[in-house]
């Protein structure tokens, strides 16, 4: 960042997109301004226009190319700068050189289904969304359960240390509905951090057999 | 089973150019990262290059970049690394390797280079 | 181009003994290190990644840590297919350099 009060955080989705905040104390709220980014050894550069998200802070998206598009290596470096428009010319207001691979946050995981529910356990699958072909398996997860009468801050958090994209929750109530989240993070990078939390899977475990011990 | 099988031994004379193969099975190799690594006596072991199949890219180390060219065949699931230009000094094992960029996660079994007049 | 630097060259320690081997890299690199094994006549083996993670199918006596640009591996106690070459590779600036070995050997 170009002074003490201005903060400009980056991170790299691993394929073709890098999401950008930029937070400065005082800023006007009706400046136009982008942020740029400008590969060391790419012939492509890539701008996006700064939005609010509050009162001191706006964000944008530098689409790369298409979804799924490994448009950035682990060995390149990506000058971003946010460049800010007074009158008739631009002025720079942070810059940072940035690898996009020690920055990451992949995209929520998707597609979480129901496998299999009984009375006490629930089986639920996932897919990880345009996560580089770079990671092998060497992703972690975490997951979360809602039960009635929590909220998902207090719900505790299952950790699974590998690449493994569905898990068995077990000793849940018969009869009751759930909700469950999986959040995603390589392992590669030093700034990396999860991805956004799933959307929720909502699910209702088997009421228990009548006159049977479950 | 992951598997990474590299062409026999050679020697070759200074100033030839050597390939060297390496065929793989057992994960899909569209989608994949191979690496050169070369070991000789005295230098101990030196990143050459990767060629990721997915983007049809290829890096190579600086202290290589002039003479080595890393190409795949993904009709075969087999990489190749051709070496110029070569020297005494050239003389060692090389390795193919299957891996993300930053780590060599399966080895080949590694392919004897001498290169002597 | 970082350098990574091995202590000691060779080691000699006692099979069910502990054995410590040291990484040292010349610039800051993070926890992008990684460590492997090689036998004679056989093609590295990767053991550790980013300085402290260990691979699936990799005993757990084989254990890594860091503190600054000085990284460790422990094997806890050592076993006869243990005595091997251990190397450290750097993945923070290409290119990505290695260390020049630690020869692990009987005592």
């Known amino acids: 960042a170009v002074n003490g009060t201005s903060r400009f955080t980056c991170f790299y989705n691993s394929r073709a997109n890098i999401s950008c905040v930029w937070s400065q104390d005082g800023a006007l709220q009706d400046t136009s301004c982008q942020v740029h980014a400008w590969p060391d050894r790419r012939r492509w550069n890539q701008t996006c226009e700064l939005l609010p998200v509050s009162q001191a802070s706006w964000a944008c998206n530098l689409i790369l190319g298409t979804p799924d598009s490994q448009k950035l290596t682990a060995v390149d470096i990506v000058t971003l700068r946010v460049m800010c428009r007074e009158g008739v010319r631009w002025r720079m207001m942070a810059i940072q050189d940035f690898k996009p691979f020690e920055n990451l946050r992949l995209m929520a995981p998707i597609s979480l289904q129901v496998v299999h529910v009984e009375t006490h356990r629930c089986n639920i699958s996932w897919k990880i969304s345009q996560a580089s072909h770079y990671f092998e398996r060497h992703l972690e997860f975490e997951a979360r359960t809602l039960s009635p009468g929590h909220t998902w801050e207090e719900a505790p958090l299952m950790t699974l240390k590998q690449k493994q994209e569905w898990i068995c929750l077990e000793t849940l109530t018969p009869d009751t509905q759930y909700e469950f989240q999986v959040r995603v993070k390589p392992l590669q990078g030093e700034f990396t951090t999860w991805s956004p939390w799933s959307q929720p899977l909502a699910f209702r475990t088997k009421p228990a057999a009548l006159g049977k011990d479950t | 089973e992951v598997q990474l099988v590299q062409s026999g031994a050679e020697v070759k004379k200074p100033g030839a150019t050597v390939k060297i193969s390496c065929k793989v099975s057992g994960f899909n190799f569209k989608y994949s990262l191979i690496h050169w690594v070369q070991q000789a006596p005295g230098k101990g072991l030196e990143w050459m290059g990767w060629?990721?199949?997915?983007?049809?890219?290829?890096e190579y180390a600086p202290g290589f970049q002039d003479r080595v060219t890393i190409t795949a065949d993904t009709s075969t699931d087999t990489a190749y690394m051709e070496l110029s230009s070569l020297r005494s000094e050239d003389t060692a094992v090389y390795y193919c390797?299957?891996?993300?960029?930053?780590?060599?996660?399966?080895w080949g079994q590694g392919t004897t280079v001498t290169v002597s007049s | 181009e970082i350098v990574m630097t091995q202590s000691p060259a060779t080691l000699s320690v006692s099979p069910g003994e502990r054995a410590t081997l040291s990484c040292r890299a010349s610039?800051?690199?993070?926890?992008?290190l990684h460590w492997y094994q090689q036998k004679p006549g056989q093609a590295p083996r990767l053991l550790i990644i980013y300085g402290l993670q260990s691979i699936s199918g990799i005993p757990a006596r084989f254990s890594g840590s860091r503190s600054g640009t000085e990284f460790t591996l422990t094997i806890s106690s050592l076993q006869s297919e243990d005595f091997a070459v251990y190397f450290c590779q750097q993945s923070n600036n290409w290119p990505y350099t290695f260390g020049q070995g630690t020869k692990l050997e009987i005592k």
């Open positions: 610039q800051i690199i993070s926890n992008n």
């Open positions: 390797a299957r891996g993300g960029p930053w780590f060599l996660s399966y």
């Open positions: 060629i990721d199949n997915e983007a049809g890219e290829t």
